[in-house]
């Protein structure tokens, strides 16, 4: 009876479990009814981080020193590149794929703390009486105009987007 | 693409004056946050003053506060920095860029040299 499925680390190839490549190899050829699996450590610059049945190795990350990458840890046959930006940098996500000098903080939220040498830019949400409309890397959430103030009303309400709406007060006759 | 060239800078003896300009292209350039950006020789990355896009609002670091002035041309794609009664510790290059401040609009900045 052929098995249906596999041990871990085994795969199912024409209804018989073959061997996995191990981390750090690519698979040449599956096995047969006489012969194991056949895997190839990955070449120069390329990795496979799992037990697989590639039949191609994974090429490292480049770290492109024009985005202002720098190879953090260099990869081995089982581990890709990790990058990071250069002094004063950082990165724009987990991956690293590029550096910004600091962030912005988007409408809605405001500047807590400007970015120093080592801190990014800190956001945060603009609380109810207050608002932003821009993205911007110094600006705090600025307080809604006080209609009152200026012997106006509200006539739209604002958010943490955007300001409030002031008119002319409805006079009695 | 994205161009932002620096000039004005040069050697200055402490207590005098410069004035900046960063050129600006391949963006609409009244529609950004500017920022002028230091590095002193062997010193990190110090973010020395902003200016929103319509000019009207500033932010300086507490280092130049009272000294620099930054502004903006918005019909001349400019960008200035004002800088007054100039200290050794303000040799710097000097860098202009915009959000979203990313590596690639990094200009090769002006030396800026106080030396007596």
């Known amino acids: 009876e052929p098995p249906t499925a596999c041990r871990e680390k085994q795969y199912l190839i024409n209804s018989q479990c073959c061997s996995l490549c191990q981390p750090g190899q690519k698979l040449v050829s599956d096995c047969t009814e006489f012969t194991e699996t056949e895997c190839l450590p990955c070449g120069e610059s390329e990795f496979l981080d799992t037990w697989n049945r590639e039949t191609h190795c994974h090429q490292h990350k480049y770290c492109d020193p024009n985005l202002g990458l720098r190879v953090q840890q260099k990869g081995t046959s089982e581990t890709d590149t990790i990058c990071t930006c250069e002094e004063g940098w950082h990165c724009t996500s987990e991956a690293c794929e590029s550096c910004v000098l600091h962030r912005s903080c988007s409408p809605g939220f405001g500047v807590k703390q400007i970015a120093t040498g080592v801190s990014d830019t800190i956001c945060e949400p603009c609380p109810v009486g207050f608002f932003s409309n821009v993205s911007s890397a110094f600006e705090k959430c600025h307080p809604w105009t006080s209609c009152e103030t200026k012997d106006l009303v509200v006539q739209q309400a604002g958010t943490n987007k955007t300001d409030v709406v002031c008119g002319p007060q409805d006079r009695l006759r | 693409e994205v161009q932002l060239l620096e000039s004005g800078g040069g050697l200055v003896q402490p207590g005098g004056s410069l004035r900046l300009s960063c050129a600006a292209s391949?963006?609409?350039?009244?529609?950004?946050e500017m920022w002028w950006v230091r590095q002193a020789p062997g010193k990190g990355l110090e973010r020395v003053s902003?200016?929103?896009?319509?000019?009207?609002?500033?932010y300086y670091a507490d280092s130049v506060k009272g000294r620099f002035t930054i502004s903006r041309d918005n019909s001349k794609n400019t960008l200035y920095l004002q800088m007054n009664s100039l200290r050794a510790d303000d040799t710097a290059v000097y860098h202009c860029?915009?959000?979203?401040?990313?590596?690639?609009?990094w200009g090769q900045g002006t030396l800026v040299t106080v030396s007596s």
């Open positions: 860029t915009k959000l979203p401040f990313i590596f690639e609009y």
């Open positions: 391949g963006f609409t350039f009244r529609d950004y």
């Open positions: 902003a200016i929103n896009p319509q000019g009207t609002r500033t």
